[in-house]
Interface confidence: medium
């Protein structure tokens, strides 16, 4: 009898260990992707940034996928999404095409099942980067809490990509799962 | 027999209560530190800010340590780190050394085991604070998701510390643990 | 005997399922509220924004309440609060009252029990929006980790509400519970 009980207890413990592991904080998906400066588009037009690191320096990913320039959701849930985008210009890089700039970021969500793209968050500023100053810098930060479904894709669009700061501490975006969908 | 089973059940319940307590949300480390305005360095150079409150007003800390101007990690994990830094100047404070300013924040991580310091996040802007206006203000916000090991230290560096806004709602930084390391 | 043990096991499983459900990530309160542009106050003075969507587009709420322009906490805990506020002006909207603007956001907490209102976070910038440019834009982002009690209310104040960008990806605020209070 006592042996039988212990076997039952082990079963209980075992099943709970599985459940605990599944629901434990370490199972939660996340990503922190940093700009890959070797492949930043030129120009001042609005473009989708497709080159990001996911496994070097501060960049990392778990239970999400990075493919074709997009961060792909593998697990339904509510996620906190964020992006930090830095722009800079030094006079040694040559003249700006225009001193009046619109420095913007757009965090977009694409659904493959229903082919559509929507902007979740935007931020930025119009700037007057006068030739009187040798150096100009500006950073944007956005963040918000969104419901994401498996298969949906997150991407980053910016204006003036040629002005992006290529440092890993400057230009990055990320996500982490906070809770399940009810 | 029945008594024995209840004892076994209590054991199961007890061990799970321990596990639940350990993994419960309330065990997760966090900190929200607000600027201590009584000790802000002067000047316009880049400095590390060492005076922060951790236990008054909005400032609070749990399962992390604040020492020597640094936020010390006590528990391995993935943390969301953030900082909000406000700069301001009123003409009644006297002249600005220069009207062209670089207002910046750097969130740095120091590892004691391998003595090294790295910038995790940066943000800011170059500003032209003209004498045409009696008051100037600018805020920076940065945030990101990082793997932190026990013993690592987080600190804040800024340019132009004499221009910092000393309010607790203006100049602060913080961290909260989101998940364990796999 | 074996049947009895199974009944006990079911009890153990059952009670743990309750606890698991209670502590599961899906029970955590959150809100993401987007600006309701049909009712933005005019003028350049500082006002409390009372019209927000909570159930359309990106806007959503769970285990929190939105009432009378305020986000009401229903569950004690530590929450991450955030706001993203965008301002914009196009010359086709007519001249600005002044070219020198103070574009600000204040995230405030009101306690009903002890009638008082306090600013948790502020951000923004003074801007010179010259008539030389046809379009102006500026975004603010703030975020921080705060202890909130049931019944407390979060609201958003801004300067220059007539300049707010009415898009759901531009002007929003939110909160999500991270952990219990010890």
């Amino acid at each position: 009898g006592s042996q039988h009980i212990r076997a039952e207890k082990a079963m209980v413990d075992g099943s709970w260990l599985d459940l605990a592991k599944r629901s434990k904080l370490e199972a939660q998906p996340f990503a922190h992707l940093t700009i890959n400066a070797t492949d930043i588009p030129s120009g001042s037009h609005k473009v989708s940034l497709s080159s990001w690191y996911h496994d070097r320096g501060w960049a990392k990913i778990s239970n999400m996928t990075f493919s074709n320039g997009k961060l792909i959701v593998n697990q339904d849930g509510f996620y906190y999404l964020y992006a930090n985008i830095c722009f800079r210009h030094h006079e040694t890089s040559g003249d700006l095409a225009t001193e009046y700039l619109q420095l913007m970021v757009y965090v977009t969500k694409t659904s493959i099942k229903i082919p559509s793209s929507h902007t979740l968050m935007k931020g930025g500023s119009t700037k007057y980067w006068s030739g009187n100053s040798e150096f100009h810098f500006y950073s944007i930060n956005v963040g918000g809490f969104f419901k994401l479904r498996s298969g949906e894709e997150i991407s980053i669009e910016v204006s003036n990509p040629s002005l992006l700061d290529p440092d890993q501490d400057a230009t990055y975006f990320g996500a982490f799962k906070v809770r399940d969908i009810d | 027999g029945s008594q024995h089973i209840r004892a076994e059940k209590a054991m199961v319940d007890g061990s799970w209560l321990d596990l639940a307590k350990r993994s419960k949300l309330e065990a997760q480390p966090f900190a929200h530190l607000t600027i201590n305005a009584t000790d802000i360095p002067s000047g316009s150079h880049k400095v590390s800010l060492s005076s922060w409150y951790h236990d008054r007003g909005w400032a609070k800390i749990s399962n992390m340590t604040f020492s020597n101007g640094k936020l010390i990690v006590n528990q391995d994990g993935f943390y969301y780190l953030y900082a909000n830094i406000c700069f301001r100047h009123h003409e009644t404070s006297g002249d600005l050394a220069t009207e062209y300013l670089q207002l910046m924040v750097y969130v740095t991580k120091t590892s004691i085991k391998i003595p090294s310091s790295h910038t995790l996040m940066k943000g800011g802007s170059t500003k032209y604070w003209s004498g045409n206006s009696e008051f100037h203000f600018y805020s920076i916000n940065v945030g990101g998701f990082f793997k932190l090991r026990s013993g690592e230290e987080i600190s804040i560096e800024v340019s132009n510390p004499s221009l910092l806004d000393p309010d607790q709602d203006a100049t602060y930084f913080g961290a909260f643990k989101v998940r364990d390391i796999d | 005997g074996s049947q009895h043990i199974r009944a006990e096991k079911a009890m153990v499983d059952g009670s743990w399922l309750d606890l698991a459900k209670r502590s599961k990530l899906e029970a955590q309160p959150f809100a993401h509220l987007t600006i309701n542009a049909t009712d933005i106050p005019s003028g350049s003075h500082k006002v409390s924004l009372s019209s927000w969507y909570h159930d359309r587009g990106w806007a959503k709420i769970s285990n929190m309440t939105f009432s009378n322009g305020k986000l009401i906490v229903n569950q004690d805990g530590f929450y991450y609060l955030y706001a993203n506020i965008c301002f914009r002006h196009h010359e086709t909207s007519g001249d600005l009252a002044t070219e020198y603007l103070q574009l600000m956001v204040y995230v405030t907490k009101t306690s009903i029990k002890i009638p008082s209102s306090h600013t948790l976070m502020k951000g923004g910038s003074t801007k010179y929006w010259s008539g030389n440019s046809e379009f102006h834009f500026y975004s603010i982002n703030v975020g921080g980790f705060f202890k909130l009690r049931s019944g407390e209310e979060i609201s958003i104040e801004v300067s220059n509400p007539s300049l707010l960008d009415p898009d759901q990806d531009a002007t929003y605020f939110g909160a999500f519970k991270v952990r219990d209070i010890d």
Partner: nanobody
Framework: EVQLVESGGGLVQAGGSLRLSCAAS???????MAWFRQAPGKEREFVAA????????YYADSVKGRFTISRDNAKNTVNLQMNSLKPDDTAVYYC????????????????WGQETQVTVSS
């Protein structure tokens, strides 16, 4: 319409003094005001500037200690008291308002007066 009208120029001997005045009309708010000068065959150069409150003043190195800029916001005027004048100070003097790009940069001012001539003889 914004108008800046200068007065007070003239001919003076080296070591003497002059007081230039600039009266502003049509300004909806008080701005940084400045004086610039341009000698024959030379670039326009910064002389002095004063912020809207009058608390902050800037001077070119060549005039520091000799020239004083002041303003009277009630009357919308800015004055330049020039002492210990030298022949090198001979130039056409301009009043300017509303610094957009930096106080010392002539390209950065939105409003300009006509001019007033200052001649310092040796």
């Amino acid at each position: 319409e914004v108008q800046l009208v200068e007065s007070g120029g003239g001919l003076v001997q080296a070591g003497g003094s002059l007081r230039l005045s600039c009266a502003a009309s049509g300004l909806t708010t008080v701005y940084t005001m400045a004086w610039f000068r341009q000698a024959p065959g030379k670039e326009r150069e910064f002389v002095a500037a004063i912020t809207r409150s009058g608390k902050t003043t800037y001077y070119a190195d060549s005039v520091k200690g000799r020239f004083t800029i002041s303003r009277d916001n009630a009357k919308n005027t800015v004055n330049l008291q020039m002492n210990s004048l030298k022949p090198d100070d001979t130039a056409v003097y301009y009043c300017a308002a509303k610094a957009l790009l930096g106080m010392t940069n002539p390209a950065g001012y939105e409003y300009w007066g006509q001019e007033t001539q200052v001649t310092v003889s040796s």
